[in-house]
């Protein structure tokens, strides 16, 4: 992991980082769960999607999310998951034409229907953390991560390197 000054220097550079190509380099269909093995689920309510963090009953099917990986021109660091020395950004889509968006004003994570090219609010820097966990840092607000708060996804400010490993911003990806 990197020190506090490293976080600040790195996150400042995020503001300027652009996606190398408009096309993802690869995609992966996975279920998303928290560090404590609660599932991230998506429910269609009143023509819009709600995001929940919940314990599923045994044998209950997990919702899948399509992670689309994009290369950034900004070099990767120790914590970021990179390819060919470039930082990786992801978008997350639980169903066709809907993507997770960072709402920085409300500190919330929302699902919005939109067309490509996607807005910056839909992009998150992927960090590979310990124990096969990942975290998602907002492209539009460096130092702010997708996290869990009161059984919902929320945006959580991380202001020191120690907090990069805090459980409420860590997620697990699995094929099952």
């Amino acid at each position: 992991a990197f020190g506090i000054s490293g976080v600040q220097k790195y996150t400042r550079a995020l503001h300027d980082s652009s996606i190398t190509g408009i096309s993802p380099i690869t995609e992966y269909l996975a279920s998303l769960s928290t560090y404590n093995d609660q599932s991230i689920t998506f429910a269609l309510e009143d023509e819009s999607y709600e995001i929940y963090v919940e314990d599923l009953k045994k044998d209950e099917k997990k919702d899948k999310v399509l992670l689309s990986y994009y290369e950034s021109q900004h070099p990767s660091n120790e914590s970021g998951d990179g390819v060919d020395g470039k930082m990786l950004m992801v978008t997350l889509s639980p169903t066709k034409d809907f993507w997770l968006h960072a709402n920085n004003k409300e500190h919330s994570v929302e699902l919005h229907k939109c067309e490509k090219p996607l807005p910056d609010q839909a992009f998150f820097v992927l960090h590979n953390m310990h124990s096969n966990c990942v975290s998602f840092e907002c492209k539009t607000d460096p130092g702010v991560f997708i996290g869990v708060k009161d059984n919902h996804l929320a945006l959580i400010k991380v202001d020191s390197s120690e907090n990069l490993c805090t459980e409420n911003i860590l997620f697990k990806l699995s094929e099952t």
């Epitope: 096309s23 998951d81 094929e175």
Partner: antibody
Framework: ELQLQESGPGLVKPSETLSLTCTVS??????????WGWIRQPPGKGLEWIGS???????YYNPSLKSRVTISVDTSKNQFSLMLTSVTAADTAVYYC????????????????????WGQGTTVTVSS | EIVLTQSPGTLSLSPGERATLSCRAS???????LAWYQQKPGQAPRLLIY???SRATGIPDRFSGSGSGTDFTLTISRLEPEDFAVYYC?????????FGGGTKVEIK
């Protein structure tokens, strides 16, 4: 630097099984966000995708070859393998292994692939 | 499956000239999931372009891709001696992925 190397017999008899292995060096199959695959090229002809695999073992095959193909992965050896049964002279080709980007199509709920790093290829001749 | 038709079959040009290679799909696809490869005799193909227009790592900027729907183009702005080879397009919008028949760029 990521490198892929194919290995296996260069001559296979008709009706027998073709077996090839691809060894990945300079990177881990397991930690990759990418997929892995096999492509072949008959003498003087174009390219044909055989199939792809994710490190978890999930496979994707060309429907035209699906009944005869098995692709498997051994993460402990950083290798993945191809088995093609009941071969004929039409299976004579240069066989390439490659790293692949996988892209999902929501409409038919399937993955398709492009190949960004290739092995040098190995020639397999089917003949008695 | 999507059939890709490349034209011309052979392109005879001199070093320094501009090469324009065409790839036409039998069905339209909205994703622009099209790749271009270069293959020299006795060698494996090398990825040049993915996503119709994104250059792969280490590919010189004289190579550019464009197009959408059914019509795609690979342009080599100024041919270098090492660019004379066979070029293949490939779609990965739908499974099974398919390749074009190739265009040979030869020295005039």
């Amino acid at each position: 630097e990521l490198q892929l190397q194919e290995s296996g017999p260069g001559l296979v008899k008709p009706s027998e099984t073709l077996s090839l292995t691809c060894t990945v060096s300079g990177g881990s199959i397991r930690s990759s966000i990418f997929y892995w695959g096999w492509i072949r090229q008959p003498p003087g002809k174009g390219l044909e995708w055989i199939g792809s695999i994710y490190y978890s073992g999930r496979t994707y095959y060309n429907p035209s070859l699906k009944s005869r193909v098995t692709i498997s992965v051994d993460t402990s050896k950083n290798q993945f393998s191809l088995m093609l049964t009941s071969v004929t002279a039409a299976d004579t080709a240069v066989y390439y292994c490659a790293r692949a980007g996988g892209l999902y199509n929501w409409n038919d709920e399937s993955f398709s692939f492009y190949m960004d790093v290739w092995g040098q290829g190995t020639t397999v001749t089917v003949s008695s | 499956e999507i059939v890709l038709t490349q034209s011309p079959g052979t392109l005879s040009l001199s070093p320094g000239e501009r090469a324009t290679l065409s790839c036409r799909a039998s069905q339209s696809f909205s994703s622009s999931y099209l790749a271009w490869y270069q293959q020299k005799p006795g060698q494996a193909p090398r990825l040049l372009i993915y996503g119709a227009s994104s250059r792969a790592t280490g590919i010189p900027d004289r190579f550019s891709g464009s197009g959408s729907g059914t019509d795609f183009t690979l342009t080599i702005s100024r041919l270098e001696p090492e660019d004379f080879a066979v070029y293949y397009c490939q779609q990965y919008d739908r499974s099974p992925l398919t390749f074009g028949g190739g265009t040979k760029v030869e020295i005039k």
